[in-house]
């Protein structure tokens, strides 16, 4: 799957949306690697 910074950001946004924003405070694009998905 795509591991560019932009892909990671969009994937994380989708994850946050589906979870209702209930995630760890440090779960942000610049802190998570592609392995988080």
């Amino acid at each position: 799957s795509c591991n560019t910074a932009t892909c990671v950001t969009h994937r994380l946004a989708g994850l946050l949306s589906r979870s209702g924003g209930v995630v760890k405070d440090n779960f942000v694009p610049t802190n998570v690697g592609s392995e988080a998905f």
Epitope: C2, T4, A5, T6, C7, T9, H10, L12, A13, L16, V28, P29, T30, N31
Partner: antibody, heavy 119, light 107 residues
Framework: EVQLVQSGAEVKKPGASVKVSCKAS????????MNWVRQAPGQRLEWIGD????????NYNQKFKGRATLTVDKSASTAYMELSSLRSEDTAVYYC????????????WGQGTTVTVSS | DIQMTQSPSSLSASVGDRVTITCKAS??????VAWFQQKPGKAPKSLIY???YRYSGVPSRFSGSGSGTDFTLTISSLQPEDFATYYC?????????FGGGTKVEIK
């Protein structure tokens, strides 16, 4: 309100260097990657590279590798793009841009910085 | 590098027209494509990400579709403020690359 405010226009001579700044506000600067894109007169957009402001990691377009340097000052929430060994073909508008999730999911762009390279 | 080929390079249309712009990638980019609108002297404005998702605040007349190598931006009913240049971008692979642009002009 999320804002990316860039430094003013620059005129440089061939062979010189230029450093463009991009001051971020309205969001957590270190949470999101910063991209740099340029557009020469009448040309398509061209991606220069991106930087992770949290760790300082960078990705560069090979076309600019060795000439472009992306850095950040976390304490000032400011990103920088330095381009060295300037030539006339580097005359362009340079933009910073960042896709933000919080507070608003959007792709924000700076207003652009015109760099003119002329002898 | 992945080449993004946009067509047409320019088109003339009237207010109310349905406008379709296409973008072809030189290799598979999945759905990792964005569309931008740019007006003279202004920074690009993001419209679409992940091929078909509109950013908040983007009018519903703008829609995107496609996957793999073929992508489309459609403006269902052209408005006066839509006359601009439109660019596609792939972000599936580094370096990110843009199409050559489609200038939408008033007929």
């Amino acid at each position: 309100e999320v804002q990316l405010v860039q430094s003013g226009a620059e005129v440089k001579k061939p062979g010189a260097s230029v450093k463009v700044s991009c001051k971020a506000s309205g969001y957590t600067f270190t949470d999101y990657y910063m991209n740099w894109v340029r557009q020469a007169p009448g040309q398509r957009l061209e991606w220069i590279g991106d930087i992770n402001p949290n760790q300082g990691g960078t990705n560069y377009n090979q076309k600019f590798k060795g000439r472009a340097t992306l850095t950040v000052d976390k304490s000032a929430s400011t990103a920088y793009m330095e381009l060295s060994s300037l030539r006339s073909e580097d005359t362009a508008v340079y933009y910073c841009a960042s896709i933000i999730i919080v507070p608003n999911y959007f792709d924000y762009w700076g207003q652009g910085t015109t760099v003119t390279v002329s002898s | 590098d992945i080449q993004m080929t946009q067509s047409p390079s320019s088109l003339s249309a009237s207010v109310g027209d349905r406008v379709t712009i296409t973008c072809k990638a030189s290799q598979n980019v999945d759905t990792n494509v964005a569309w931008f609108q740019q007006k003279p002297g202004k920074a690009p404005k993001s419209l679409i990400y992940s091929a078909s998702y509109r950013y908040s605040g983007v009018p519903s007349r703008f829609s995107g579709s496609g996957s793999g190598t073929d992508f489309t931006l459609t403006i269902s009913s052209l408005q006066p403020e839509d006359f601009a240049t439109y660019y596609c971008q792939q972000y599936n692979n580094y370096p990110y690359t843009f199409g050559g642009g489609t200038k939408v002009e008033i007929k």
